[in-house]
């Protein structure tokens, strides 16, 4: 057993049948010694009598509110909640495996820029009785701040039969050089409470790996005279990194007819601008990529030839 | 270290080219060793990152840009800083600076080339003659010293008078191909900045 | 093995027009970038246009834009540059090139594969 927070406690509990549980003592946080009862949640049934109570905690029903009174006023509360081991693995049955990049991936993180800040996400089918807690540092042995906001209800879904719920948890690293080298990565801790079942997930990761460049903008085209040709061009995105010489980003043109049917033409360039031959109906996409560390494309920004 | 006298040419473009080289050829060689040694704990979250050009180089500190100084992060570990009298910038200490910042590269690709070239003769006596390093590779580090055109002392050659141990250092060439693809992509930023500047 | 093989140069007026022609073999070059670069007596290797594998997307030198224009024709693996307006300036050794890539580079050692050139003089 462990404190999770003032008053909160998780029992960690290998789960299999006609398991013993864990024994578990609890004391009343009073200078009180005599007269004492305990109780359970709402159930006005007394478990036991005295400054300490001893409970042997199996499954669920054994979880949740302890209350020590005297003449019906409440002393101390401690809530138990249960951390389950199936065949040594901990549980986690709260957030949803996404599955990218690559299986049991329930925490997916990424950075817009090397400013130090990121922000991360999950998902989840539980609508209620749900909380979150964040923790992040740069390494684990000697950890460096990173702080995080508080985690919030980002976008919902409807899957199938059930709807899908999207958290989001922004965070910044205290002391961030855009230009350092990352050797520590940054470490990321959720706690996760459904009723009365505790689960924690982690992710780690550098910076640089978790990099998704915003989209670039300003994407504009402009006719060239007597041709069927037209000069695209666009500009670095407004949350990047600069300078951008130096944090010089990549390019992928496209150009896409309306059919599938159409062949399709993809390049990259370093360049912001190009010229196209624009057919009717066609359209001009461009991507973004750092030019020297082949993290995510950014999504694609669009125009239409017409 | 031997610091040049000298200012740094201004055209950087040989150096950006051979830069651009540097790093294609170590993610290259990168992706070979990941794929050849994928029974190795060889890829970014297996390894422990070191850096053996640390306290003995400071290239991100003396490369740092301009518009990053201001930045008190990227100012910690500096024992000089561009900025000078009231913020003003020299041109002397700009170009003592760019100076700076070019040996430092220089003196991390000679680090880089003796290791990569002492553990290549260990990788050539290994019977499984499994994996070794690519000669694109050290020719294009090669390429980019001569021309950062600096002169400095040569470091002789590490011999080992010990039986290697194989799989250790194919778990060391591992740690220093990941470690040298971030170098050379620190290098990369720093040449087209330079470049444009 | 790829080999490219310029043609259509010579000798021209300012003002007059050329149309020169890269027919490449021994290998499909319909999936890669191909490009046009020059080289002057006594000055660099410069970047002239560059075009994508379908040909919808081309990147030009400022000093030939709107005058020069980049094409190709995939059924007969072959790349065209039209040269409209010629100047003096334009006097110089016209190379074609490819990485067997999708890069639209304009620097010469982003491209691999060189052809031999074909000399193109504008003299009045």
């Known amino acids: 057993i462990w404190e999770l927070k003032k008053d909160v406690y998780v029992v960690e509990l290998d789960w299999y049948p006609d398991a013993p549980g864990e024994m578990v003592v609890l004391t009343c946080d009073t200078p009180e010694e005599d007269g004492i009862t305990w109780t359970l949640d709402q159930s006005s049934e007394v478990l036991g009598s005295g400054k300490t109570l001893t409970i042997q905690v199996k499954e669920f029903g054994d979880a949740g509110q302890y209350t020590c009174h005297k003449g019906g006023e409440v002393l101390s509360h401690s809530l138990l909640l249960l951390h389950k081991k199936e065949d040594g693995i901990w549980s986690t049955d709260i957030l949803k495996d996404q599955k990218e990049p690559k299986n049991k991936t329930f925490l997916r993180c990424e950075a817009k820029n090397y400013s130090g800040r990121f922000t991360c996400w999950w998902l989840t089918t539980i609508s209620t009785d749900l909380t979150f807690s964040v923790k992040s540092s740069r390494g684990s042995s000697d950890p460096q701040g990173v702080t995080c906001g508080a985690a919030t209800l980002s976008a919902e879904r409807v899957r199938g039969d059930n709807k899908e719920y999207e958290y989001s948890v922004e965070c910044q690293e205290d002391s961030a050089c855009p230009a350092a080298e990352e050797s520590l990565p940054i470490e990321v801790m959720v706690d996760a409470v459904h009723k009365l079942k505790y689960e924690n997930y982690t992710s780690s990761f550098f910076i640089r790996d978790i990099i998704k460049p915003d989209p670039p903008k300003n994407l504009q085209l402009k006719p060239l005279k007597n041709s069927r040709q037209v000069e695209v061009s666009w500009e670095y995105p407004d949350t990047w990194s600069t300078p951008h010489s130096y944090f010089s980003l990549t390019f992928c043109v496209q150009v896409q007819g309306k059919s599938k049917r159409e062949k399709k033409d993809r390049v990259f360039t370093d360049k912001t601008s190009a010229t196209v031959i624009c057919r009717k109906n066609a359209s001009i996409s461009v991507r973004a990529q750092d030019r020297y560390y082949s993290s995510s494309w950014s999504e694609w920004a669009s125009v239409p030839c017409s | 270290r031997n610091l040049p006298v000298a200012t740094p040419d201004p055209g950087m473009f040989p150096c950006l080219h051979h830069s651009q080289n540097l790093l294609r050829a170590v993610s290259n060689m990168l992706q070979k060793a990941r794929q050849t040694l994928e029974f190795y704990p060889c890829t970014s979250e297996e390894i422990d990152h070191e850096d053996i050009t640390k306290d003995k180089t400071s290239t991100v500190e003396a490369c740092l840009p301009l518009e990053l100084t201001k930045n008190e992060s990227c100012l910690n570990s500096r024992e000089t800083s561009f900025i000078t009298n009231g913020s003003c910038l020299a041109s002397r200490k700009t170009s003592f600076m760019m100076a700076l910042c070019l040996s430092s590269i220089y003196e991390d690709l000679k680090m880089y080339q003796v290791e990569f070239k002492t553990m290549n003769a260990k990788l050539l006596m290994d019977p499984k003659r499994q994996i070794f390093l690519d000669q694109n590779m050290l020719a294009v580090i090669d390429e980019l010293m001569q021309a950062l055109n600096f002169n400095s002392e040569t470091v002789p050659q590490k011999s080992s008078l010990e039986e290697p141990d194989f799989y250790k250092t194919k778990i060391k060439l591992c740690i220093l191909l990941h470690a040298f693809r971030i170098r050379a992509v620190t290098i990369d930023r720093v040449m087209s900045y330079l470049n444009a500047s | 093995e790829v080999q490219l093989v310029e043609s259509g140069g010579g000798l021209v007026q300012p003002g007059g027009s050329l149309r020169l022609s890269c027919a490449a073999s021994?290998?499909?070059?319909?999936?890669?970038?191909m490009a046009w670069f020059r080289q002057a007596p006594g000055k660099e290797r410069e970047f002239v246009a560059t075009i994508s594998p379908v040909g919808f997307i081309m990147d030009y030198a400022d000093s030939v834009k709107g005058r020069f224009t980049i094409s190709r024709d995939n059924t007969k693996n072959t790349v065209y540059l039209q040269m409209n307006s010629l100047k003096h300036e334009d006097t110089a050794l016209y190379y074609c090139?490819?990485?067997?890539?999708?890069?639209?580079?304009?620097?010469?050692?982003?491209?691999?594969?060189w052809g031999q050139g074909t000399q193109v003089t504008v003299s009045s």
């Open positions: 021994g290998r499909t070059l319909s999936s890669y970038t």
């Open positions: 090139a490819t990485d067997l890539g999708r890069k639209l580079g304009t620097q010469s050692c982003e491209y691999g594969y």
